[in-house]
Interface confidence: low
């Protein structure tokens, strides 16, 4: 299964935050998306394996790291109102 944490988050502008994503299926590929009204799912970053990450369609304002296969945290260094969204993490073989 894929687990995101936290499920809900309210924060203030400019305060760094991390949204965690973990999976226990030994998947190599992991990806972060945001879903916004009228825009559908847009990929933020993805990772093909440990230490291999790449930018998706809307990477601006986000960072990621992939130190272990199971974890792929999404980092908002300085959150802004335009990052208010519904975020999804996904993984696959």
């Amino acid at each position: 299964q894929v687990t995101q944490n936290p499920r809900y988050l309210i924060t203030v502008t400019g305060k760094k935050l991390t949204v965690t994503c973990s999976q226990n299926m030994n998947h190599e590929y992991m990806s972060w998306y945001r879903q916004d009204p009228g825009l559908g799912l847009r990929q933020i970053y993805y990772s093909m394996n440990v230490e291999v990450t790449d930018k998706g369609d809307v990477p601006e304002g986000y960072k990621v790291s992939r130190k272990e296969k199971r974890n792929f945290p999404l980092i908002l260094e300085s959150p802004s109102p335009n990052q208010t969204s519904l975020y999804f993490c996904a993984s696959s073989l």
Partner: antibody, heavy 118, light 111 residues
Framework: EVQLQQSGAELVKPGASVKLSCTAS????????MYWVKQRPEQGLEWIGR????????KYDPKFQDKATITADSSSNTAYLQLSSLPSEDTAVYYC???????????WGQGTSVTVSS | DIVLTQSPASLAVSLGQRATISCRAS??????????MHWYQQKPGQPPKLLIY???NLESGIPARFSGSGSRTDFTLTINPVEADDVATYYC?????????FGGGTKLEIK
């Protein structure tokens, strides 16, 4: 509007070095990858390498490893290609390009002509 | 390095007819459900222009006359119908493995 503006034509002597620039507008270079491609007269395209301007990480085709140095300055939204020890075979047009769609090059500069001649 | 072999090196097609260009890779360019093969058009004195990304995706602003297909090692660019403005050299390019490589190009002319 996305644009890549490259520096002007260069005439250099054999053995010399040259540094080409590629200034982006309409997007932040640190949100993409920047590439350099070589095209000799009447020849095909050769991939030189790429840089991730967000962190400076570079990757080169091994045949250009000792020839080319790619750098970027996010503050000026500019990528650079430095070519060293130029022989006449390096006479070519050098293109910069923006990378997205997982590495396809969706916008290109107009090219910089480099002529190596004594 | 992955070698991309384009064929034919040149072709002449009548206006309104179909042009088909092939690109064969020396090894698979597929990863994670994607084919990392792209197609570009270059006209004399101009930089290349992206037509198709990831094998079959039409770049924004490119006419639907252009289409791409294929997977793993065999890819095709199709122009149907060919128009006078399509006279150019077409290149395939792979980005599945470093170093990225280009095919040798196919020159399209009007018959």
């Amino acid at each position: 509007e996305v644009q890549l503006q490259q520096s002007g034509a260069e005439l250099v002597k054999p053995g010399a070095s040259v540094k080409l620039s590629c200034t982006a507008s309409g997007f932040k270079t640190e949100d993409t990858y920047m590439y350099w491609v070589k095209q000799r007269p009447e020849q095909g395209l050769e991939w030189i390498g790429r840089i991730d301007p967000a962190n400076g990480n570079t990757k080169y085709d091994p045949k250009f490893q000792d020839k080319a140095t790619i750098t970027a300055d996010s503050s000026s939204n500019t990528a650079y290609l430095q070519l060293s020890s130029l022989p006449s075979e390096d006479t070519a047009v050098y293109y910069c390009a923006r990378g997205s769609y997982y590495y396809a090059m969706d916008y290109w500069g107009q090219g910089t002509s480099v002529t190596v001649s004594s | 390095d992955i070698v991309l072999t384009q064929s034919p090196a040149s072709l002449a097609v009548s206006l309104g007819q179909r042009a088909t260009i092939s690109c064969r890779a020396s090894e698979s360019v597929d990863s994670y459900g994607n084919s990392f093969m792209h197609w570009y058009q270059q006209k004399p004195g101009q930089p290349p222009k992206l037509l198709i990304y990831r094998a079959s995706n039409l770049e924004s602003g490119i006419p639907a006359r252009f289409s791409g297909s294929g997977s793993r090692t065999d890819f095709t660019l199709t122009i149907n119908p060919v128009e006078a403005d399509d006279v150019a050299t077409y290149y395939c390019q792979q980005s599945n493995e470093d170093p990225y490589t280009f095919g040798g190009g196919t020159k399209l002319e009007i018959k």
